[in-house]
Interface confidence: medium
C-alpha cells in the first residue's frame, strides 16, 4: 500500500522559518503534489504550493521556495511574519496524486518537544485520505 510521509522542521536561525518535506512511498508515477496548511487540501486547508512534473511549481505566501528533492519527494521552505506566519502547532499536509494508485495525503506538524533546528525523522505519517 502506498504511503505518504511528512516531516516538519523549524529552522534554528530563523524561528519563523519552517521546512516541510514530504515523500511518496509507492511505485506509481506522481502527477501532482499539493502542500497545504491548516488541514487537508479541500477540507479547510490553504494551499501553499502545487508541484506538477510538466507545468512546474506554483507557490503562495508565505511559501518561499518549493522544490522537488527526488522524483518522489519534495521540500517547501516557509517564512512569515505577522498574520501569515506559521506557528509551532500548525498542521501541514501533502497530497500526492499518482498513477495508478490515485491520491494519497498525510499531515504532520512540528514535534511538540522539538527545539529549533531539530525535527522528528521522516517516518510515514498517518494516511488521512486515499481517493
Amino acid at each position: 500500500t502506498p504511503e505518504v510521509w511528512v516531516q516538519v522542521r523549524m529552522e534554528a536561525t530563523e524561528l519563523s522559518s519552517f521546512t516541510i518535506r514530504c515523500g511518496f512511498l509507492g511505485s506509481g508515477s506522481i502527477s501532482l503534489v499539493t502542500v497545504s496548511w491548516g488541514g487537508p487540501n479541500g477540507a479547510g486547508g490553504t494551499t501553499l504550493a502545487v508541484l506538477h512534473p510538466e507545468r512546474g511549481i506554483r507557490q503562495w505566501a508565505p511559501a518561499r521556495q518549493a522544490r522537488w528533492e527526488t522524483q518522489s519527494s519534495i521540500s517547501l521552505i516557509l517564512e512569515g511574519s505577522g498574520a501569515s506566519s506559521p506557528c509551532a502547532n500548525t498542521t501541514f499536509c501533502c497530497k500526492f496524486a499518482s498513477f495508478p494508485e490515485g491520491s494519497w495525503e498525510a499531515c504532520g506538524s512540528l514535534p511538540p518537544s522539538s527545539d529549533p533546528g531539530l525535527s522528528a525523522p521522516p517516518t510515514p505519517a498517518p494516511i488521512l485520505r486515499a481517493d
Epitope: H52, P53, E54, R64
Partner: antibody, heavy 122, light 106 residues
Framework: EVQLVESGGGLVQPGRSLRLSCTAS????????MSWFRQAPGKGLEWVGF??????????EYTASVKGRFTISRDGSKSIAYLQMNSLKTEDTAVYYC?????????????WGQGTTVTVSS | DIQMTQSPSSLSASVGDRVTITCRAS??????LNWYQQKPGKAPKLLIY???SLQSGVPSRFSGSGSGTDFTLTISSLQPEDFATYYC????????FGGGTKVEIK
C-alpha cells in the same frame, strides 16, 4: 530524426482566425507536452501556451494576452499539435514556433520547429 | 508571473574571449532555469537546462550556474559560431524569458 514542422501561417485581417499545425516525427508524440511560442519582429521570445502529455491528461495553459482567443489541442493519431487563433489582433503578428516539451518541466524545450510567420494586418 | 531580467542586453567580444551573461528572477526559482541560443531567422536551441545541466550535443565551452534568483551563462572561449542572441527562461508556467543578450563581434 526527431523533428517538428509548423504550417498554416500567413496574412490575415484583424478579427479573423487562423489555425497553425505542428507535425511531429521521430518520437512518441503522446509522451511529451507540446508548447507554442512566438517572436514579434525584432523582439524576444514569448510563451503562448502549452498542452500536457497524454499521461497528464492534456491540460492546457495560456499566457494572459491570448487566453480566451487561442486554443491548443493535439491529435495523437496524427502526431499533430494545433494552435487555433481567433479574434486576431495586429499585436499577434509574429513568427510562431512549436516546441517539444517539457517532458519534465526542469528539462526545457529540447526540440523546436522552424517557425511559421503570422501577419495580422488590414 | 515571474519576471526575468537579463544583462547585458548586448555585448561585443572577440573569438577566444570568455563571455558571461547574467539572468535574475523576480522570485526564487530554485534551479529551474534554461538557456537558449538563437541565430537570426532560426529557431531557439536549448543549451543548458536546470541551471547547470548541459544539453546533449552542446559544446562543453558552454556552462551554467546559479540557484534561487541569480544565474549565469558562461562561454569559456567564444567561437565564431557562438555569435547569436541568448535567452534565459524560467521553467514553471506561465513560462517567461529574459529580454535576450546579443553577442556581437568586436
Amino acid at each position: 530524426e526527431v523533428q517538428l514542422v509548423e504550417s498554416g501561417g500567413g496574412l490575415v485581417q484583424p478579427g479573423r482566425s487562423l489555425r497553425l499545425s505542428c507535425t511531429a516525427s521521430g518520437f512518441t508524440f503522446g509522451d511529451y507536452a507540446m508548447s507554442w511560442f512566438r517572436q514579434a519582429p525584432g523582439k524576444g521570445l514569448e510563451w503562448v501556451g502549452f498542452i500536457g502529455s497524454k499521461f497528464y491528461g492534456g491540460e492546457t495553459e495560456y499566457t494572459a494576452s491570448v487566453k480566451g482567443r487561442f486554443t491548443i489541442s493535439r491529435d495523437g493519431s496524427k502526431s499533430i499539435a494545433y494552435l487555433q487563433m481567433n479574434s486576431l489582433k495586429t499585436e499577434d503578428t509574429a513568427v510562431y514556433y512549436c516546441a517539444r516539451g517539457p517532458r519534465r518541466y526542469t528539462y526545457g524545450m529540447d526540440v523546436w520547429g522552424q517557425g511559421t510567420t503570422v501577419t495580422v494586418s488590414s | 508571473d515571474i519576471q526575468m531580467t537579463q544583462s547585458p542586453s548586448s555585448l561585443s567580444a572577440s573569438v577566444g574571449d570568455r563571455v558571461t551573461i547574467t539572468c535574475r528572477a523576480s522570485q526564487s526559482i530554485s534551479s529551474y532555469l534554461n538557456w537558449y541560443q538563437q541565430k537570426p531567422g532560426k529557431a531557439p536551441k536549448l543549451l543548458i537546462y536546470a541551471a547547470s545541466s548541459l544539453q546533449s550535443g552542446v559544446p562543453s565551452r558552454f556552462s551554467g550556474s546559479g540557484s534561487g534568483t541569480d544565474f549565469t551563462l558562461t562561454i569559456s572561449s567564444l567561437q565564431p559560431e557562438d555569435f547569436a542572441t541568448y535567452y534565459c527562461q524560467q521553467s514553471s508556467t506561465p513560462l517567461t524569458f529574459g529580454g535576450g543578450t546579443k553577442v556581437e563581434i568586436k
